[in-house]
């Protein structure tokens, strides 16, 4: 990825930004992401083992969309979380979360998206991840399932 | 809360931004938008025949919401796409997409929204559009159905 | 449309930003928000009686998510609004709104989110609020229900 310049401060610096898209070879949590091909962006932020690693403290808008679908609805509870991990806290911190229950008609083919987005004060070395409850129900098309952020 | 510095450009320049709202005389795809009245914004970006035309290469946050509703649910599959067209690609590029299937109880009055938003590296002369699968099921209230972007 | 200047500061100034999270002692409309503890942000914007008060005219990205859930679905219509009030207009202005009808199977435990986010030109002294139709169906976890903005 080439870096993208942010508006014109004295020295041209990389705009901290990421847009990662669904990767269908995710086998476990957290989700893994495509960080190289397609409509992907990665500049001034690092991608490491499913996570976006912050390298400059500041305010970030963080977002994610997950597209769930299935052949035959059984209304399994769905959850979609963006969470943060760092060395200072033993526990993961859930930043944003969406849950769905009783969302389709039993037996029918179904599809539904969950979108999350908000502003957070992130610290250098924070790691951000996305978790879902039912990996087998996620569709990983690049336009449908994604994870991103940018520094304000 | 500690304060966070905003970016420091020397010269006052137009912020590239758009927020267009639903226009009920949309008769075909892509959707048409209100670009003049109400809570509309259009600055440093051109609106032309349904599309937002980029005139400066850079990083943009692009978003859209569509409000679908009907008098009697028959669970027609719904889709909501933000796509891009330019001279370099013969094909439209779907940037973001939401799909819904089996989302309401047959025969009942129903309503549902789809929200999309993400960061993209756009090039001068790219044109962005919004497409839906079922035009007759879209409600075009300005607070409910909209399309916008801003340059980071 | 008049063009909107992007931020010009020579001096490092507070980034105008807010991220407020759900507060379970909300008893009436508009919703009340947690403005002190947890993953809350409040800088260069004031929180007053459920509302975010703008103190500098300009372009803002405004967002909110509300998490609705219930023990036994009866498909009460749900609405989620971000609206604006100021001294110049007698009427509230609905900026963004989401509605849901016929969204779950009668009698079942259910859960659903509504997300809104867009850009608006706000004026100093504008007050922004969030309204929902069914307060008793809102879950106020900080990761699930929130309200925020930042100045572009």
């Amino acid at each position: 990825q080439i870096g993208h310049p942010s508006p014109p401060p004295e020295k041209k610096e990389l705009r901290k930004v990421a847009h990662l898209t669904g990767k269908s070879n995710s086998r476990s949590m957290p989700l893994e992401w495509e960080d190289t091909y397609g409509i992907v962006l990665l500049s001034g932020v690092k991608y490491k083992k499913g996570g976006l690693v912050i390298n400059e403290t500041g305010l970030y808008f963080v977002y994610s969309k997950v597209y769930f679908r299935g052949q035959s609805c059984n209304n399994l509870p769905l959850s979609h979380k963006v969470y943060m991990r760092n060395s200072k806290y033993p526990q993961d911190l859930v930043m944003m979360e969406g849950k769905m229950m009783s969302y389709c008609t039993t037996g029918q083919m179904w599809a539904r998206s969950s979108y999350l987005g908000a502003v957070f004060n992130l610290t250098s070395a924070d790691h951000l991840y996305v978790n879902v409850s039912e990996l087998s129900l996620v569709n990983f098309e690049e336009s449908q399932t994604f994870f991103g952020l940018y520094k304000l | 809360q500690i304060g966070h510095p905003s970016p420091p450009p020397e010269k006052k320049e137009l912020r590239k931004v758009a927020h267009l709202t639903g226009k009920s005389n949309s008769r075909s795809m892509p959707l048409e938008w209100e670009d003049t009245y109400g809570i509309v914004l259009l600055s440093g970006v051109k609106y032309k025949k349904g599309g937002l035309v980029i005139n400066e290469t850079g990083l943009y946050f692009v978003y859209s919401k569509v409000y679908f509703r009907g008098q009697s649910c028959n669970n027609l599959p719904l889709s909501h796409k933000v796509y891009m067209r330019n001279s370099k690609y013969p094909q439209d590029l779907v940037m973001m997409e939401g799909k819904m299937m089996s989302y309401c109880t047959t025969g009942q009055m129903w309503a549902r929204s789809s929200y999309l938003g993400a960061v993209f590296n756009l090039t001068s002369a790219d044109h962005l559009y919004v497409n839906v699968s079922e035009l007759s099921l879209v409600n075009f209230e300005e607070s409910q159905t909209f399309f916008g972007l801003y340059k980071l | 449309q008049i063009g909107h200047p992007s931020p010009p500061p020579e001096k490092k100034e507070l980034r105008k930003v807010a991220h407020l999270t759900g507060k379970s002692n909300s008893r009436s409309m508009p919703l009340e928000w947690e403005d002190t503890y947890g993953i809350v942000l409040l800088s260069g914007v004031k929180y007053k009686k459920g509302g975010l008060v703008i103190n500098e005219t300009g372009l803002y990205f405004v967002y909110s998510k509300v998490y609705f859930r219930g023990q036994s679905c009866n498909n009460l219509p749900l609405s989620h609004k971000v609206y604006m009030r100021n001294s110049k207009y007698p009427q509230d202005l609905v900026m963004m709104e989401g509605k849901m009808m016929s969204y779950c199977t009668t009698g079942q435990m259910w859960a659903r989110s509504s997300y809104l986010g867009a850009v608006f030109n706000l004026t100093s002294a504008d007050h922004l609020y969030v309204n929902v139709s069914e307060l008793s169906l809102v879950n106020f976890e900080e990761s699930q229900t929130f309200f925020g903005l930042y100045k572009l």
């Epitope: - | 005389n25 008769r27 075909s28 795809m29 892509p30 959707l31 048409e32 051109k46 032309k48 025949k49 349904g50 599309g51 035309v53 980029i54 005139n55 067209r85 330019n86 001279s87 001068s124 002369a125 790219d126 044109h127 559009y129 | -």
Partner: antibody, heavy 117, light 109 residues
């Protein structure tokens, strides 16, 4: 006025660049410069337009790929055509239209392209 | 997007009236983005009507455009010999797509 040039007799498979030159004015804001063609004894067929404000380009679905419209200067618009076939034999017109609605106000006299072996 | 001019040729006497129809496969932009052109042999087309019903400058008021959405009509009244020509409709659509109708020849007797 507008004037087209570059029309010629060419062999199938060849490429050609047509030029549209404005005299007495330059392409003004809010207008598109377009190419339209007309095969002998046939109707008009829209090919492509370019927005004079930002060089955004718009093509007929059948024209994508083989036809390229560009604006090298404020008074010149080009149309490049590749892999020419006999079906491309036509008079090629350039015309200006308002960007917000179709109104091809000003037309050039046309330039003839003949594709034959 | 397909524009269909149902009649390939119409004829009428001097002083009479002719009506030319143009049907679009989908609604034109803002329901009125349709124009009409007159073309004579070995000449480029000339704009007559734009936005469905607005008369282009210098065009006599004998030419009248009407219609909305997908159905449009050009009416030429008080027909003159000089009106003998081929008439084309053109539609503008969202995404800045244009299309021409197949043309209708007007023969003045």
């Amino acid at each position: 006025s507008l004037e087209e040039s570059g029309g010629d007799l060419v062999k199938p498979g060849a490429s050609l660049t047509l030029t549209c030159t404005a005299s007495g004015f330059s392409f003004s804001s809010g207008y598109d410069m377009c190419w339209v063609r007309q095969a002998p004894g046939k109707g008009l067929e829209w090919i492509a337009c370019i927005d004079t404000d930002n060089d955004a380009t718009y093509y007929a679905s059948w024209a994508k790929g083989r036809f390229t419209i560009s604006k090298p200067s404020s008074t010149t618009v080009l149309l490049q055509i590749t892999s020419l076939t006999a079906a491309d034999t036509a008079t090629y017109f350039c015309a200006t239209t308002h960007g917000d609605y179709v109104a091809f106000k000003l037309w050039g006299p046309g330039t003839l392209v003949t594709v034959s072996s | 997007q397909v524009l269909t001019q149902t009649a390939s040729s119409v004829s009428a006497a001097v002083g009479g009236t002719v009506t030319i129809n143009c049907q679009s496969s989908q609604s034109v932009y803002k329901n009125n983005d349709l124009s009409w052109y007159q073309q004579k042999p070995r000449q480029p087309p000339k704009l007559l009507i734009y936005q469905a019903s607005k008369l282009a400058s210098g065009v006599p008021s004998r030419f009248k455009g009407s219609g909305s959405g997908t159905q449009f009509t050009l009416t030429i009244g008080d027909l003159e010999c000089d009106d003998g020509a081929t008439y084309y409709c053109a539609g503008g659509y969202t995404a800045s797509i244009y299309a021409f109708g197949g043309g209708t020849e007007v023969v003045v007797k």
